[in-house]
Interface confidence: medium
């Protein structure tokens, strides 16, 4: 629908509170280095302007697009050139090029200080003193660190954040109440950010068709009783929502997401029997609940897929009629029958099917040519099954920390050029697949594991894209979205890598390690492990294990010593010498 004033339309649809929150998120995701106060000022100016447009849609500038209005506002920031360098050149462009330019300058790894959690009493005082500012600051800090965070979902996180403080700041033991809730929000938030980052990468790097294929497969698994036309409609609407959010159109995205939730709930009888509880919740909870809803039961007595997609004499004719519709139907039919497969596996099967039809429908005897296409699926299905089985066995033997270390060694040998912090972050996350997925029964392991790995490997891809150092990473990240994991799995030790020069400073530790949390201490040790492998890529597992065991004993010993710093200095030198000897450095 055409509206005289887009800004007035969105303000009325979303309400003032959500409007202000979403504009703040949008601005913080674009200008990630700007101080909080500057953003609040910009948001208030935009909000006051929106109110004038609500009062009179014909008022001056009210007919401008949101990109024009927001871009003009961002370009008033005085320190743009000093703070952002070449991003300031975006302001010389016209829409839509200006917005595209801002999008290209979003930084997945901004140089921002780590968020340190203050004492609980300090947080509760700040919350009570000015609740609105406290919550805005939460939105701002998350948005600037996660420039692709799914904005309407961030509103849901903020609502839970507020609820946690409202409840816990009145509790007898504030810390016992609040800290687990904040930990849960932090972990869920990181996971949500990473999942959304994959959606945006899919749209931006591989196009709408790739995203739609992903959505057909996932929604067909989730809503196996829904008809193909219904799934297709949901896919179109979902694609619009995510295209908008990934493109910085956060007001439109939130508005359209609300409309989609409304549609799903109004039509739940023809979509899924699992939606009832979700649809009784308020808007933000409802949308979140729908996004996470469990798979509905598969309809009974679904006919064999082979009848329509292999045995039918009409396969090539139906394919020629509307290729993407026919492939969409194939994906829908396969996915609704296979909640036990990962989405990426389903997409590989659909790609294999498409390639076979492209080849066979131009052949002299098409049917004879594609008759065995389902046989080609067998190795594609078995590969992730076997990989998950092996890795879950390894995880069960080693536990999470040592499993992460095994992956650290494996991935450092594959792509040693990648920065150590990135290798540590990505391998730690890859290792979490064990505790996240191996506990599931066979039928749920693959969708859990392989789709989670897709999210984690996308983190590697976006971080590597910022500073490309490895052709192998670039190749695996860019050639095929659905084959990223098999591509990385297939990489062997990089024989072309010239080992890093040994630097004793890298392996010098201080007493501050003793006061770190267990997680931070693990990261320090894992950082050392990566550096070891970079120095000695041909080191055996046994050699590395011996050095890491010595290192753990060294840290434990010195942290118990009276003069910790002296212990670290003296024993550290001995450890470095022993490690060099053990590894032949």
């Amino acid at each position: 629908d055409a509206h005289k004033s887009e800004v007035a339309h969105r303000f009325k649809d979303l309400g003032e509170e959500n409007f202000k929150a979403l504009v703040l998120i949008a601005f913080a995701q674009y200008l990630q280095q700007c101080p909080f106060e500057d953003h609040v000022k910009l948001v208030n100016e935009v909000t006051e302007f929106a109110k004038t447009c609500v009062a009179d849609e014909s008022a001056e500038n009210c007919d401008k697009s949101l990109h024009t209005l927001f871009g003009d506002k961002l370009c008033t920031v005085a320190t743009l050139r000093e703070t952002y360098g070449e991003m300031a050149d975006c302001c010389a462009k016209q829409e839509p090029e200006r917005n595209e330019c801002f999008l290209q300058h979003k930084d997945d790894n901004p140089n921002l200080p780590r968020l340190v959690r203050p004492e609980v009493d300090v947080m509760c005082t700040a919350f009570h003193d000015n609740e609105e500012t406290f919550l805005k600051k939460y939105l701002y800090e998350i948005a600037r660190r996660h420039p692709y965070f799914y904005a309407p979902e961030l509103l849901f996180f903020a609502k839970r954040y507020k609820a946690a403080f409202t409840e816990c700041c009145q509790a007898a033991d504030k810390a016992a109440c609040l800290l687990p809730k904040l930990d849960e929000l932090r972990d869920e938030g990181k996971a949500s950010s990473a999942k959304q980052r994959l959606k945006c990468a899919s749209l931006q790097k591989f196009g709408e068709r790739a995203f739609k294929a992903w959505a057909v497969a996932r929604l067909s698994q989730r809503f196996p009783k829904a008809e193909f036309a219904e799934v297709s409609k949901l896919v179109t609407d979902l694609t619009k929502v995510h295209t908008e959010c990934c493109h910085g159109d956060l007001l439109e995205c939130a508005d359209d997401r609300a409309d989609l939730a409304k549609y799903i709930c109004e039509n739940q009888d023809s979509i899924s029997s699992k939606l009832k509880e979700c649809c009784e919740k308020p808007l933000l909870e409802k949308s979140h609940c729908i996004a996470e809803v469990e798979n509905d039961e598969m309809p009974a007595d679904l006919p064999s897929l082979a009848a329509d997609f292999v045995e039918s004499k009409d396969v090539c004719k139906n394919y020629a009629e509307a290729k993407d519709v026919f492939l969409g139907m194939f994906l829908y039919e396969y996915a609704r029958r296979h909640p036990d497969y990962s989405v990426v596996l389903l997409l590989r099967l659909a790609k294999t099917y498409e390639t076979t039809l492209e080849k066979c429908c131009a052949a002299a005897d098409p049917h004879e040519c594609y008759a065995k296409v389902f046989d080609e699926f067998k190795p594609l299905v078995e590969e992730p099954q076997n990989l998950i089985k092996q890795n879950c066995e390894l995880f069960e033997q080693l536990g999470e920390y040592k499993f992460q270390n095994a992956l650290l060694v494996r991935y450092t040998k594959k792509v040693p050029q990648v920065s150590t912090p990135t290798l540590v972050e990505v391998s730690r996350n890859l290792g979490k697949v064990g505790s996240k997925c191996c506990k599931h029964p066979e039928a749920k392991r693959m969708p859990c594991a392989e789709d989670y790995l897709s999210v984690v490997l996308n983190q590697l891809c976006v971080l590597h894209e910022k500073t490309p150092v490895s052709d192998r990473v670039t190749k695996c990240c860019t050639e095929s979205l659905v084959n990223r994991r098999p591509c990385f799995s297939a990489l062997e030790v990089d024989e072309t890598y010239v080992p890093k020069e040994f630097n004793a400073e890298t392996f010098t530790f201080h007493a501050d390690i003793c006061t770190l949390s267990e997680k931070e201490r693990q990261i320090k040790k894992q950082t050392a492990l990566v550096e070891l492998v970079k120095h000695k890529p041909k080191a055996t597992k046994e050699q590395l294990k011996a050095v890491m065991d010595d290192f753990a004993a060294f840290v434990e010993k010195c942290c118990k010593a009276d003069d910790k710093e002296t212990c670290f200095a003296e024993e550290g030198k001995k450890l470095v010498a022993a490690s060099q000897a053990a590894l032949g450095l």
Epitope: K233, K313, N318, A320, A322, D324, G328, A362
Partner: antibody, heavy 119, light 111 residues
Amino acid sequence: EVQLVQSGAEVKKPGESLKISCKGSGYSFTNYWIGWVRQMPGEGLEWMGIIYPGDSDTRYSPSFEGQVTISADKSISTAYLQWSSLKASDTAMYYCARLHGVVSRGDYWGQGTLVTVSS
Amino acid sequence: QSALTQPASVSGSPGQSITISCSGISSLAGSYNLVSWYQQYPGKAPKLIIYEVTKRPSGVSNRFSGSKSGNTASLTISGLQADDEAEYSCSSYAGRNAVAVFGGGTQLTVL
């Protein structure tokens, strides 16, 4: 080079029968749908129906069902449109098009056949 | 009566941009971007200028662009030229086992 060549213009009387043709060349005739389109004088385009020469599967737009017959002979890569009893209202230009899917993507067109029905 | 609705005529001056709308796109056609646009000069066969909503066949000027919002597709011609004066028709997929449909056509006049 892909080409669709249609038969020449026809002048007929009401009640007469007629069969016009569309010969494809330069591509695999059996693997693409062929569509027929009517354009009455001064009017817009209308899809009449489609045929898949590979197995002669034929579909008609509701307003043309029973009014015309679409057929194909894959051995000579030719599609046909025929009337058993013409009416004055059948006066129009008729085009055939190769369809890249029935998604209305007619990427190659014949030059058109003008059919005039008048007593 | 066409299932797709287009304005009967639009006009613009050389150098300007014009947009022709085509409403009534089915949900399935929308989901899979199955909308095409044709240009037709008097006495000539139609020519495909846009397919799958936004794609241009090779040889078609980049002044022609397509888009879609909801159940409405649009054709935009930028930098109008005298030889753009023609009839423009949209066409869309009508569902499996069905025949596609055309819009009523829009006559573009370059002033």
